[in-house]
Amino acid sequence: VPRWRQQWSGPGTTKRFPETVLARCVKYTEIHPEMRHVDCQSVWDAFKGAFISKHPCNITEEDYQPLMKLGTQTVPCNKILLWSRIKDLAHQFTQVQRDMFTLEDTLLGYLADDLTWCGEFNTSKINYQSCPDWRKDCSNNPVSVFWKTVSRRFAEAACDVVHVMLNGSRSKIFDKNSTFGSVEVHNLQPEKVQTLEAWVIHGGREDSRDLCQDPTIKELESIISKRNIQFSCKNIYRPDKFLQCVKNPEDSSCTSEI
């Protein structure tokens, strides 16, 4: 008789999850000499220890502390790029602008990017059938708590001018419920961070509106200003040209507004 198992609303653990985490760790530590000391088997053990045998709606930041220790990494605190709802462009940007970093350019972010995982209470099994959905099931699930934990630490480490890329095509350009809006904004340290500069990315080629005047951007400005951090905003009208100009800043067409 098959044992009854909890059916969650979200997709199950990514197939070959253990192998993927281990392989990504090995690849990352080979590419980044400053992380060569990391023992990837310990990283996997720490990752596994954070959620295996635990109820997938009862995960805490504390569960991830061994993994956080192993993944401790120094990135230049003035070269941090946050993003919300526009991950692909943010990653394309840091692939070109190699001295800037998104969370997914760090070891822990790289390990977990686009993956889903959860276990089952009191068993050593990984649940490949379903995992809790943040909205429909519970917010304290393994994936959400992981991203909340690493995002908080990433924001806390930032200094000087912090950049954030926002999606101008969405109804809420700044969304208070996103990881950026609910975690990162509130964990920037006013004693270290001078300015948050938002880059609002336009979707349509003919879109010449000033999206920095959008009510949600004004809301972001208000939140940031109350935290004694300066706020600035730029429209990126042509994201394709923007990336091209990051690659080739000497190009004559790059002096005009992007």
Partner: antibody, heavy 116, light 107 residues
Framework: QVQLQQPGPELVKPVASVKISCKTS????????MNWVKQRPGKGLEWIGW????????NYNGKFKGKATLTADKSSSTAYMQLSSLTSEDSAVYFC?????????WGQGTSVTVSS | DIVMTQSHKFMSTSVGDRVSITCKAS??????VAWYQQKPGQSPKLLIY???SRHTGVPDRFTGSGSGTDFTLTISNVQSEDLADYFC?????????FGSGTKLEIK
């Protein structure tokens, strides 16, 4: 296999203190949990606690709080355990051992004898 | 504290035999269990972790099994060099605790 080097036997007087070292050649010293384990003849193995050299975080077995103090020096990749107010009950072999999910690397042990 | 009970202080076996050493936890530790071998005058060596994962370099005649409260270390095709003490350890809860050990004797 990385070696954990511990000093030879120690003979100490009651009430005195002793500090045992555990040196490793491991480049991953800072990101390893370093445990200390006590073994008395016929008494099996007792976990004293661990230190994580990367940030100095420690976790002690309540039984050894106030008795053992764990420290680490990242520059020399050396972990230390100081035992204070020694009594005959503290006579034992003390091992350092690396790992958090099973201790995968052990020092050869340091025998501590408390005797006047 | 979680008590790890190894009910057999001694076990006797012959070369080529199969022997199972058991360990019982006083509460559920799921699979957070390691097994160690300690030969006379030596420090312990890790054999098994996460209840059933063999540590690097450990011969495949050593097998770990179990979850929850009952755990077993099985040595198949026992060799004379397997004469040693065997300890289980849980790392599910602090403080980490060890079993009292089982001495394997070769007839």
């Amino acid at each position: 296999q990385v070696q954990l080097q511990q000093p030879g036997p120690e003979l100490v007087k009651p009430v005195a203190s002793v500090k045992i070292s555990c040196k490793t050649s491991d480049y991953a010293f800072s990101s390893s949990w370093m445990n200390w384990v006590k073994q008395r003849p016929g008494k099996g193995l007792e976990w004293i606690g661990w230190i994580y050299p990367g940030d100095g975080d420690t976790n002690y077995n309540g039984k050894f709080k106030g008795k053992a103090t764990l420290t680490a020096d990242k520059s020399s990749s050396t972990a230390y355990m100081q035992l204070s107010s020694l009594t005959s009950e503290d006579s034992a072999v003390y091992f350092c051992a690396r790992g958090r999910w099973g201790m995968d690397n052990w020092g050869q042990g340091t025998s501590v004898t408390v005797s006047s | 504290d979680i008590v790890m009970t190894q009910s057999h202080k001694f076990m006797s076996t012959s070369v080529g035999d199969r022997v199972s050493i058991t360990c019982k936890a006083s509460q559920n530790v799921v699979t957070a269990v390691a097994w160690y071998q300690q030969k006379p005058g030596q420090s312990p060596k890790l054999l098994i972790y996460w209840a059933s994962s063999r540590h690097t370099g450990v011969p495949d005649r050593f097998t770990g099994s179990g979850s929850g409260t009952d755990f077993t270390l099985t040595i198949s095709n026992v060799q004379s060099e397997d004469l040693a003490d065997y300890f289980c350890q849980q790392y599910s809860n602090y403080p980490f605790t060890f079993g009292s050990g089982t001495k394997l004797e070769i007839k």
